[in-house]
Interface confidence: medium
């Protein structure tokens, strides 16, 4: 019969044969062969896969590292990572939480929908068109951009999310 | 490096005033929003105080507003927090921050006391 060019779901080619994918939790030994199986071994204490995966190595479960502020707020499995929070009064940096912070920063391009308190976190809403911001603050809005027209000014340069517009004098050339 | 160097703090009575200082060096000191931020003896971090990079934008937590005053001089690179009418519950050690990240350039502190 002709060598497969596919494999089925879970499966993957190899030396032109189909072999079965590891499942989630344990690591590639042996590819299969005409005569055996694909030969998988578990991930160790502090190691896992979440696919179906043809890996030789487990990655390492995440550190939550208390000198950054995190705490673990889920142990990890043979198949899942670990998932760190950060300690109480603190929030994470970002979805992958890597890091803390007392309360979050926009950065440019986004300015603060709502100032933190002591239980949430900063809200920051992208600058809709118009206006702008600048730099990374835990406080500011986004500005308007400037009205060039109301100081008898052109726009030169046009304003972004995070920069003003520039203004400039009227051209007196026109007929 | 960043150095942040926090002094003023002292014990006052209830009511009284103090002004706290932060000298800071190692960056560009009117780029970036500076703040106060406190922790009373065996509680968590409280933000106390913020100030646009321009000084020209303040913020204050709703338990000091009226009291306290943060500015600051870029001239000298230095942060202010003037502390008027002072509280039993404003006893704490004052940091300043230049970031509110986790071991994020904090300075040492300087211990406030009201007291009696």
């Known amino acids: 019969p002709e060598p497969p060019t596919a494999c089925r779901e879970k499966q993957y080619l190899i030396n032109s044969q189909c072999c079965s994918l590891c499942q989630p939790g344990q690591k590639l030994v042996s590819d299969c062969t005409e005569f055996t199986e694909t030969e998988c071994l578990p991930c160790g204490e502090s190691e896992f896969l979440d696919t179906w995966n043809r890996e030789t190595h487990c990655h390492q479960h995440k550190y939550c590292d208390p000198n950054l502020g995190l705490r673990v707020q889920q142990k990890g499995t043979s198949e899942t990572d670990t998932i760190c929070t950060c300690e109480e009064g603190w929030h994470c940096t970002s979805e992958a939480c890597e890091s803390c912070v007392l309360h979050r920063s926009c950065s440019p391009g986004f300015g603060v929908k709502q100032i933190a308190t002591g239980v949430s976190d900063t809200i920051c809403e992208p600058c809709p068109v118009g206006f702008f911001s600048n730099v990374s603050s835990a406080f500011e809005k986004c500005h308007p951009w400037t009205s060039c027209e109301t100081k008898d000014l052109v726009v030169q340069q046009a304003g972004t999310n995070k920069t003003d517009v520039v203004c400039g004098p009227q051209d007196r050339l026109r007929a | 490096e960043v150095q942040l160097l926090e002094s003023g703090g002292g014990l006052v009575q209830p009511g009284g005033s103090l002004r706290l200082s932060c000298a800071a060096s190692?960056?560009?000191?009117?780029?970036?929003?500076m703040q106060w931020v406190r922790q009373a003896p065996g509680k968590g971090l409280e933000w106390v105080s913020a100030?646009?990079?321009?000084?020209?934008?303040?913020y204050y937590a709703d338990s000091v507003k009226g009291r306290f005053t943060i500015s600051r001089d870029n001239s000298k690179n230095t942060l202010y927090l003037q502390m008027n009418s002072l509280r039993a519950e404003d006893t704490a050690v004052y940091y300043c921050?230049?970031?509110?990240?986790?071991?994020?350039?904090w300075g040492q502190g300087t211990l406030v006391t009201v007291s009696s």
């Open positions: 921050a230049k970031e509110l990240g986790y071991f994020d350039y």
């Open positions: 100030i646009s990079g321009d000084g020209y934008r303040t």
């Open positions: 190692g960056f560009t000191f009117e780029w970036y929003e």
